[in-house]
Every structure is written in C-alpha cells, then in structure tokens.
Interface confidence: low
Amino acid sequence: AIVFIKQPSSQDALQGRRALLRCEVEAPGLVHVYWLLDGAPVQDTERRFTQGSSLSFAAVDRLQDSGTFQCVARDDVTGEEARSANASFNIKWIEAGPVVLKHPASEAEIQPQTQVTLRCHIDGHPRPTYQWFRDGTPLSDGQSNNTVSSKERNLTLRPAGPEHSGLYSCCAHNAFGQACSSQNFTLSIADESFARVVLAPQDVIVARNEEAMFHCQFSAQPPPNLQWLFEDETPITNRSRPPHLRRATVFANGSLLLTQVRPRNAGVYRCIGQGQRGPPVILEATLHLAEIEDMPLFEPRVFTAGSEERVTCLPPKGLPEPSVWWEHAGVRLPTHGRVYQKGHELVLASIAESDAGVYTCHAANLAGQRRQDVNITVATVPTWLKKPQDSQLEEGKPGYLHCLTQATPKPTVVWYRNQMLISEDSRFEVFKNGTLRINNVEVYDGTWYRCVSSTPAGSIEAQARVQVLEKLKFTPPPQPQQCMEFDKEATVPCSATGREKPTIKWERADGSSLPEWVTDNAGTLHFARVTRDDAGNYTCIASNGPQGQIRAHVQLTVAVFITFKVEPERTTVYQGHTALLQCEAQGDPKPLIQWKGKDRILDPTKLGPRMHIFQNGSLVIHDVAPEDSGRYTCIAGNSCNIKHTEAPLYVVDKPVPEESEGPGSPPPYKMIQT
C-alpha cells in the first residue's frame, strides 16, 4: 500500500516570496508523484515546480496559486493511487492603485458647497488600513469639515470648499506591508474671488516690423485685475509704457498688441491676474523674432542614367523651423513620381539624360526665404570621334596618337603602353582632348598603346601599334678626338644604324687614301703599328639607300703614353723637418704633374710658404707637422692619357737618444734627415 509519510498542509504565504508544499511517500513498488490544483495537474514552470515529491514555489502568485493543492502518488504497475489531504495558501498581498473621484461623476461637476468623495484604489489581503493626505499632510477624522474613516478607502468632503483644494494621496498597510497611491488626485475648488484662467497667452513668432498679439483673460467675482509685464518686471499699460514698448497696446479684454516688432521686443511677457482673494496667477508667453540663416552650398553632382540617386537639402537654421521644398525649371517637385521630393530629399528614380539640369532647394519661414542650386549632370558613356590608329613615328621627332571621344561629363582619358599606365613626364603628354604626344620618339617606343576614355557611366577603349622609323645615326657617335699610342696596334671603331643597315667607310679628311698598313674593316679603322704620320683628321661615312649618308669627323693624335721615371716612396720625417716626395713622368705630349694630398688637389698658386712643387714635379714640404701625415698622389697627364702613383707620408716626433744607443745609431725606420 502507498503511505504518505509527509502530507501538504495549508499555510500563510507572502505574495512574491518562496513557499513549499511538502509531500513524502512510501510504497513497495515504484510510484510516481504529481500535484493537482483544483483537480487539474500542475505543470512545472520556472516559478512553480516539483522538487522531489514536494511542490516548490520560487515566488507565490496570488492569482495563479489560489485554490486547493493535492499530492497524488500512483503505482503504474498495479494502478494503485493515493491522494494527500488538501492544502491551500492564505496569500497576503498589497497592491497600489490611483486616487479616483467617486462622487460627483466628473470633475466638471465639482462646485463649491457640494459633497466630494474620493476613493483610494489600494487593495490587499488582509484588508488594508487607509491613511489620507492633502498636499503631503495627513488628514484625521473630522478635520476641517471632512468626514473620513481611516479604515475605509473612501474620503468624503462635505461640503467641499476652496480650502479643500490640493493634491490628495493615500497610503495603506496590512500584514504584507505598505503601499501608496500610484496616481494622485488634484482637487481644485475655485473660490469665485480667486482669479481663474480663461485664456492663456501663447508663445508667438513674428517677423521684424510685423505685429504680435498676446491674448490673456481671467475670471473672478468681483472681476480680477490684469497686468502685463515684460522681462525686467516693468508694467505695460496704455498710460505708462517702457520706452522700447511705445507701440504696445493693452485692450480692455486683456489682449496685448505689439506693432512694428523689433529685436528688443523679443522676450518673456507675463500676464498677471489678481482676484480679490488668493494668489496672483502668472501666465508667461515668449515673443520670438523670426530668423532664418543662409543655406550651405551644394557640390555639383554627377549621376548615371538608370540609377536611383538622392540629394539631401539641409534646411537652414531658423525660427520657426523653415519649410523645405525642391523646384526644377521653376516648378515645384511633386511628392511622388519618378523625380520627386521625399522629406528634405530630392529623389531621382531611374535617372534619364533629360533629368540633367539645375535643381533648387528652397527654405522659407516668417523671416524670409533662402535658396540654393545644385547642378545635376547625367553621365553618358563616351563615344568615339577619333580612335588611335597604327602609326609610323619618326625617331627623334614628336609623335601623336589620337583618342578623341565625347560624353557628359567630359570624359577622362588615360593611356597605357605595354599594359603599363603612362604617367605624364618629360617625354609623354596627354592633351585635354585625349591626344597622346610622345616627345623625341625613341626606338623602344615602338610597341602597343591603348587609350581608355571614361565617365561615371562607363568607358570605351582602343589600341594601336606604333612602329618607329629609325633615323640614320652613329651608334655610338665616334669621339671627335682620340689618341693612339705610338708604335702600338690601334683600332678606331665606327658603327651606325638606320631603317636599312648602312654601309660604313673611313677616309682621310683631305680625301687621300688610307696607307696600306691601315685597314678599314666593316667600319673599324685598324692601325697595325702606329706611326707619327698616322696622326690627322679622319671621316667615318655611314650611308644607305633611303636615308643618304652621315659623316663623323675624328682627329687622331699619336702619342707616347705616360710612364713614371721616378715615383714617390713611403716617407717618414721628423716633425719640424722637411719632406721631399719625388715624382717624374715622361710621355708625348710632355705630361704635366699635379699632386693630391689628403684627398684634395694641391693648387700650386695656393700652397703657402711651406709647400712647393718643383719644375721636375717633386713636392717639398718644409717644417712638417703631424697634420701633414697622409697619402700623397702624383698625377701625370697629357691630352692623351693620365696616370697616377701614390705614397704615404708619416710625420713623427724626434726621439731623445738613450745612453745605450751611441750617437751614430740609425733610426728604426727610413728617415729623411735634413
């Protein structure tokens, strides 16, 4: 048999707090336990769930957990079932609500001397005890002609008078806790002698020099006083107006009229109503001067046909906020269609070429109107006027390749050479019309060229091959002056290129034929053994059929190349002594000697008193100092060649002789002693 060891029991619970209904079962077989609420199975939720056999509540809910709970144990094999005793919750709760008018039926019916009943809609269990407040001050029974039961939710004012006016609120408490009204009730019982607002002035915005009207009316018995003030509390009356409000008129009905409004009139105007009794009623309204700023400029826009584009018009700052509209060709755009206005935006759906033109954004308010134009261009794909053509360009001359196209907007043209973008430099120039100019055409300019013409709408391209017509020229041009070494073999080369391979021949400038020991071999002049007579002027002639002939003149000099008879040696000198660096060279023409010391040429005219270069080429340095140390180079040169040789100079301190060394002991290194 199934036996309940622990059964659920009825208990107090607090709204929103934890609770547990216990249930423990003992049975021979395997049983499963479930719970019923008012006879229906309880489904587990995050809030309410079975915990073992017990039913756990994370937060008791007064609506969902009211009723009778029962624990049921069932043996599914035998079908035996046992039910626990019934258990329920006594849920304690309190919930805030508003203060509402119970009697009369509407606020409009509240009159002095009538009965007014307010109801406090705070509910709870157990039944709460209520406390009423007016303007935050607690009300007690029988206080100032009001009947109030603090245990009741109703507050009755009988009869209600102006003194009962105020903000009514209520609080209530019970075993669960306390709550106060979620929405309070303002009771306004007018004293006939109090000033009451009939018509309140409204803020106005006017343009300079226009007129502004403020309406203001109060009612009371007897009739109230009405006074207008501006900013610094200066009264405005028809008899006494502030100097800058001389054009102000106060009408009998309380309205204030300002004519020819100026900036100084802008500000806060106060209308004050004062009844026989009660506080003054102050109403405020502001007079704003209308204003409108300038509009920012539009950048010109380029759109492509078929696309959808929008242009936003930023309205200028202004008071009141300016209205914005778009116009095209003097006509206001509609709010729908293919070209229309949406908010502040100009919308062009599926753009056509005919949509191009000037569109104007207008903004206007009381202060005036502003406008700003935007130029819209509808881009078209370029078309050819002149494509680049295969061309033969002459070497050394300027060459042109044309790429003439037309489109809107004006197309941009770029050129490629062998698929590489041509950037403008000293040799390449792209004209505004797209033509490419190659300055001083070179042989390697013979290749493929491609031009691309583009607009935002698309691009077109074409290519052409350039063939360079090579000019007849020496490659390289022979040196106009050359030297040959006497009694040696020598060659003088001459080569040329042209559209056709040129023939090359040498001749003496005087027209005489070459001696038999001098041969002309395919443009190379060969001297088997140079003699003095071989010196003179020679001409290299290159020629071909289509281009004629060219000549190069060469003056050949026969020379004995330079050799050094005496070369400077590594030299060490005592500080303060004299150094001599010898150098002598021979050759024909007779070579000149120059010295370089410590990486600079020694100018014979600027040597100073310590240095001298002799006629034979030797260099002498008197009174040597440590800074004179270094490498010295002797350079020998003539019109035919140049040679150099170098040696180091060391300047050392003179040693003090030691006793162990005799007066004739040689120094440990080669010295020049003077």
């Epitope: 900013e231 610094d232 509390e233 200066t234 502030p242 100097p243 800058h244 001389r246 020819q260 100026r262 900036p263 100084r264």
Partner: antibody, heavy 125, light 107 residues
Framework: EVQLVESGGGLVQPGGSLKLSCAAS????????MHWVRQASGKGLEWVGR??????????AYAASVKGRFTISRDDSKNTAYLQMNSLKTEDTAVYYC????????????????WGQGTLVTVSS | DIQMTQSPSSLSASVGDRVTITCQAS??????LNWYQQKPGKAPKVLIY???NLETGVPSRFSGSGSGTDFTFTISSLQPEDIATYYC?????????FGGGTKVEIK
C-alpha cells in the same frame, strides 16, 4: 528725489587700476540697468558699458575700446554700481558718469533720466 | 557698431533764429533716437526721445523729426539759455552711440 553719486576718480599711471563707485537712491535700483558714460575734456559723450538687473542675470555689455580691461558690477544690497578699470591708458582720461533710465532694466532704455555729477579720471605718467 | 554723424559741429545764431541740427545713422534705426542738451560742467539732459517726443518740462521750441537713418533737431526760436552742446544718441542696438555733438553759440 533721485540721486546718483560717483566716486573713486583720481590720478593714476598708465597700466594702473582704479575702481569707481556709483551710489543710487530715490528709485528701484535693483530692477534697473546701470550704464557708464564718459566724456574726455572738450570731446563728445562715449558709452562705456552697462549691467542689467538680477532678473536678467546681471548681464554686462561693453564698448569695444574698453572690453577686456573694464568690468562693471553691482551690489543691490548697497544700491551701488561699480566700474573696475584695469590696464588704464592715457586715452581713458575723462569724466565718468553713471546713468540710468530709473525704472527700467532694459538694454534699450530709451534715454537716461538720471545722471550723476561725474568723477574725473586722469591717466598720466 | 552704428555710427552717428552729426552736423554741423558748431554754429552761431542770433536770438530768435531758427536753428537746425541733423544726425545721420550708418544703418536703419527706426525712430530709436534721442537728443540731449549739455551745458558746460553739467551732465547731459534729455530733450527729445524716440526721435520726436518732447520730454516732460522741456520748452516747446525744441522739436525733433525723422526716421530710419536721417533725423533733424530744431530750435524754433533761439534763446540765450539755449547756449549748450547738443548730442544725438541711438539706442537701436548695443553699443549705444552718440553723435559728435553740435556747439550752439549766440552771435
């Protein structure tokens, strides 16, 4: 009877400072804007600046020639307006008047009903 | 700033003469203009406010007219006690500015 009495004038060296006072009586000082006007010897009138009432946040305004050097303040409890003059220049030498519309605290008071007798400020080395 | 140009800078007239002084504003100031009289050693005194309104207690021989930028001050019959310097002043905008003044003397 309305009275405005200036004081605090005197001889001061260029670069020096001086504070002028203007004691008011006979009208609602606290609700009135107070202005300072000066007049160099043999020359015309030059508006120096003004201070508005408490209701208008004691807003001040100055002529360009004195902006950054002169400061106008007021003490409503003493019915007194002040002109603090710093970094004085020789061209600031003048008779300084304090003046008011009397009942109005506006910037744009039509004209000055009330004037003090003036106080002489001499800036010289 | 609004410049006020007053002319002439000085004038000499006989007792009983009609005297006219003009004042020109560098921009439109509507009728926000006053005329002051200043006698030697004294503070200025307002004669005309709002371009054409005579201040209480001021003799009717003084008058003013004009609007916008051009204004005129007139003494219909000059009296010995009218010897003084007369100034116009605009209050259309800050800074408040005065004309250079017109010194009136009796021949």
């Amino acid at each position: 009877e309305v009275q405005l009495v200036e004081s605090g004038g005197g001889l001061v060296q260029p670069g020096g400072s001086l504070k002028l006072s203007c004691a008011a009586s006979g009208f609602t000082f606290s609700g009135s804007a107070m202005h300072w006007v000066r007049q160099a010897s043999g020359k015309g009138l030059e508006w120096v600046g003004r201070i508005r009432s408490k209701a208008n946040s004691y807003a001040t305004a100055y002529a360009a020639s004195v902006k950054g050097r002169f400061t106008i303040s007021r003490d409503d409890s003493k019915n007194t307006a002040y002109l603090q003059m710093n970094s004085l220049k020789t061209e600031d030498t003048a008779v300084y008047y304090c003046t008011s519309r009397g009942y109005s605290g506006y910037d744009y008071s039509s004209y000055f009903d009330y004037w003090g007798q003036g106080t002489l400020v001499t800036v010289s080395s | 700033d609004i410049q006020m140009t007053q002319s002439p800078s000085s004038l000499s007239a006989s007792v009983g003469d009609r005297v006219t002084i003009t004042c020109q504003a560098s921009q439109d100031i509507s009728n926000y203009l006053n005329w002051y009289q200043q006698k030697p050693g004294k503070a200025p005194k307002v004669l005309i406010y709002d371009a054409s309104n005579l201040e209480t207690g001021v003799p009717s021989r003084f008058s003013g007219s004009g609007s916008g930028t051009d204004f005129t001050f007139t003494i219909s019959s000059l009296q010995p006690e009218d010897i003084a310097t007369y100034y116009c002043q605009q209050y259309d905008n800050l800074p408040l500015t005065f004309g250079g003044g017109t010194k009136v003397e009796i021949k």
